[in-house]
């Protein structure tokens, strides 16, 4: 082994790069001493380097650290934080559109109904966002609210319009009725089922989001123990007290260092691929009732389909609720309130085509091909760390800790290390409490994840009842079927397409309207997006 | 120390209501998720319901579906438990237990329902 | 929902015995899987996680092992605070199932 190489007689070299991490030259010696007082770069012989040096150089240490581990997530954050805002503007487009949808059905077909429609639907919606960003609302609470308060409204305007004014205080007993005899059908069930189960997913979608943004912020801003600081001073500094001002760490050498560093954070590795790999599932199983795009952009449809069930039953129902409510029937139901062959104007929306369309459900699977890229990201974390700070190739001529070597030898540097500290030690201590917060909640999100994915081979939940209507009964081909009364049926296209300008914004007025198309398809319908010509029928 | 101790049982009535508190102490308890256990008279143990560390994403055991509503104070490191509409099948020991791996639980408080 | 079915429901064993419990779930839980000892009038305690790790401060002779969904806890040597009930307990996915347990008797 050669002997190393005579330390600068004046501790020169030394001097001038310390003074770049430390204005000021008291703490550095004119000429090598004996260095009895060290504790991290034990001296061989003389040495350019006092206990004061050595603090500071540890602290430097560990800022570099906690930089290049910054440095190394930068990319994997910036993702997250961008697809965690792009998917929420995203979703509170599509409640926005949904809720202009179902307003302009109600202009369109029961005029008489606004202004107190807008309202209820107002809220509904205010409560779907809310939901969607992790307020504790109950979804069946939300639909059962919007179910309540319809329906005093349709029974005296629509079902019984004469009423005279002394009658109208019958609401509360309107909103009960309205439970009690199903004046509905089964369409509130319905859009329970699949309001709640498309956005329990797009809920736990963004949180599972918000929670990798909290995964790396957490690990960014972990503060390194004093053990790692030592090891990393040896590493990176020790070889400057005795004049190697140019020599390089051995390669394996960094990787031992930067794992013993490192124990706690790749801890997480198992948890962060289980993450990715949940998320994964999640994201494979948003579609049909799963996918709130699709659910809340027919609503309009589905919520049309119910008024139209209570005016076919409204003779039954107004003589049922005369005797319950105890209020004079002033006027027969009439039959042509029904809106059956309302026709509307036509109504194309002209909207800048884009050549490129993008679904959300493609930029969905656009992320999770992209987080897929970083699944190895903590347990790679130790070698990235050292490919990207000064380390000598191929373990030749390099710093081992202790002296300048020609080979690196794992063995000699850890029985080197041991006089110092026993890396098992640091390794068996555990991570930080932080560290084991943060796994907490990737093991929670992941059940989460995992409870809302929807395992292999399980066919969509039936919710069959005496009306015979299906939730999520559609063939694999075909897009989820909406509504469901049997006559009117509409196929939703899943059609929202991103754009740059995705805060383009609907008005009622804009709303799709009732064109009539000239194609076989002409039941189908295309949801709004912010691309392309439109045409949708609302009837 | 890492502690949870869980107070509120009782002797109820069926048809009747109870509300349970664990309070935590030693660790950060906005960090956990945390659930609720039960274990009848010389049965099993039967989880009850879980909640989120920010109280968002709630869980519920078909058995008590409809009828129990688990909630959390961060701000007073308190888990709850609210029981409602209780019958005789709801008799139990009722635990708190920490994280998604519920690896520290409380002594337990019982409840007992009864006419 | 996922099942869990633990064997023996009870067994007999002496001091110093080796002793195997077995777990089976229902479907795939790849080793989200965890054991509990429990006491008479005491709250369960967590001895293994994720199939095969030891909780800090378990003693060593308590060992798990499985993947999928068979699952095995082995006590390498019992020792007379070891008699208890065992229950295995699945965390993979809501809701939360445990087994019925195995009660380890003084023979």
């Known amino acids: 082994q050669p002997p190393p190489p005579p330390p600068d007689a004046t501790c020169h070299q030394v001097r001038s790069f310390f003074q770049r991490l430390q204005p000021g030259l008291k703490w550095v010696p004119e000429t090598p001493v004996p260095g009895s007082d060290l504790q991290v770069c034990l001296p061989k012989g003389p040495t350019c380097c006092s206990r004061k040096m050595e603090e500071k150089y540890q602290l430097t240490a560990r800022l570099n650290m906690e930089q290049l581990l910054q440095s190394a997530s930068m990319e994997l954050k910036f993702l997250i934080i961008q697809n965690a805002a792009v998917f929420q503007e995203a979703f509170e487009i599509v409640v926005r559109h949904a809720k202009n949808y179902t307003n302009a059905m109600f202009k369109n077909n029961y005029p008489s109904l606004t202004p107190q429609a807008f309202e209820f639907v107002g809220e509904f919606f205010t409560d779907v966002s809310l939901y969607i960003l992790g307020s504790d609302i109950n979804v069946d609470d939300m639909v059962n609210e919007l179910f309540d308060s319809l329906f005093p409204v349709i029974y005296t305007q629509l079902m019984n319009p004469g009423l005279p004014d002394s009658a109208l205080d019958i609401n509360e007993c309107l909103r009960g009725a309205r439970r009690d005899l199903k004046v509905f059908g089964n369409f509130p069930k319905l859009i329970m089922t699949q309001v709640s189960k498309s956005l329990q997913v797009t809920r736990i979608f963004l949180q599972a989001l918000n929670l990798g943004i909290e995964v790396i912020n957490t690990t960014d801003h972990l503060k390194f123990s004093k053990d790692c600081g030592r090891m990393l001073t040896r590493m990176w500094y020790c070889s400057y007290c005795q004049g190697l001002m140019m020599v390089k760490p051995c390669g394996g050498y960094c990787n031992v260092v930067m794992q013993g560093c490192m124990a706690g954070v790749v801890e997480i590795d198992k948890y962060w691929r289980e993450y990715i790999l949940s998320l994964e599932e999640l994201v494979n199983g948003m579609y049909r009732i799963y996918d709130m795009e699709n659910v809340l952009l027919g609503l309009f449809s589905t919520i049309h389909d119910s008024i139209q069930y209570v005016q076919k039953n409204a003779g039954k129902l107004t003589t049922t609720i005369g005797k319950l409510c105890a209020h004079s029937q002033q006027r027969q139901y009439r039959s042509a309130y029904y809106p059956e062959d309302l026709f509307i104007d036509k109504k194309v929306l002209k909207v800048a085509h884009v050549e490129h369309e993008e679904t959300l459900s493609s930029r969905r699977r656009e992320l999770i091909q992209k987080l897929k890229s970083f699944i190895s990201f903590y347990s790679a974390l130790p070698g990235y760390i050292c490919s990207h700070s000064p380390v000598a190739e191929n373990d030749t001529l390099c710093w081992n800790g202790q002296e300048l070597v020609e080979r690196y030898s794992q063995k000699a540097a850890r029985n080197g290390m041991k006089n110092q500290f026993n890396l098992h030690e640091l390794k068996m201590k555990g991570p930080e409490p932080v560290v084991s917060q943060i796994i907490d909640k990737l093991k929670h999100i992941n059940q989460l994840l995992r409870t809302m994915s929807m395992p292999k081979g399980r066919v969509l939940d039936k919710n069959l009842d005496e009306e015979g209507f299906e939730s999520g009964d559609c063939g694999d081909d075909e897009d989820e079927c909406i509504g469901g009364s049997g006559d009117g049926m509409i196929k939703v296209k899943n059609q929202l397409r991103f754009l740059a300008e995705l805060a383009y914004d609907l008005d009622v007025d804009d709303a799709p309207g009732n064109s009539q198309q000239a194609t076989p398809k002409d039941n189908e319908i295309s949801t709004f997006h912010n691309l392309g010509n439109v045409h949708s029928p609302l009837k | 120390e890492v502690q949870l101790v869980e107070t509120g049982g009782g002797v109820v009535q069926p048809g009747r209501s109870l509300r349970l508190s664990c309070a935590a102490s030693?660790?950060?308890?906005?960090?956990?998720?945390m659930h609720w256990v039960r274990q009848a008279p010389g049965k099993g143990l039967e989880w009850v319901a879980v909640?989120?560390?920010?109280?968002?994403?709630?869980y519920y055991a078909d058995s008590v579906k409809g009828r129990f509503t688990i909630s959390r104070d961060n701000s007073k490191n308190t888990l709850y438990l609210q029981m409602n509409s209780l019958r005789a099948e709801d008799t139990a020991v009722y635990y708190c237990a920490r994280g998604a791996g519920m690896d520290v639980w409380g002594q337990g408080t019982t409840v007992t329902v009864s006419s | 929902d996922i099942q869990m079915t633990q064997s023996p429901s009870s067994l007999s064993a002496s001091v110093g015995d080796r002793v195997t419990i077995t777990c089976r779930a229902s479907q795939s839980i790849e080793d989200d899987l965890a054991w509990y000892q429990q006491k008479p009038g005491k709250a369960p305690k967590l001895l293994i996680y994720e199939a095969s790790n030891l909780q800090s401060g378990v003693p060593s002779r308590f060992s798990g092992s499985g993947s999928g969904t068979d699952f095995t806890l082995t006590i390498s040597s019992l020792q007379p605070e070891d008699f208890a009930t065992y229950y295995c307990q699945q965390h993979d996915s809501y809701p939360l199932t445990f087994g019925q347990g195995t009660k380890v008797e003084i023979k």
């Open positions: 030693g660790f950060t308890f906005s960090s956990y998720a």
């Open positions: 909640i989120s560390y920010d109280g968002s994403n709630k």
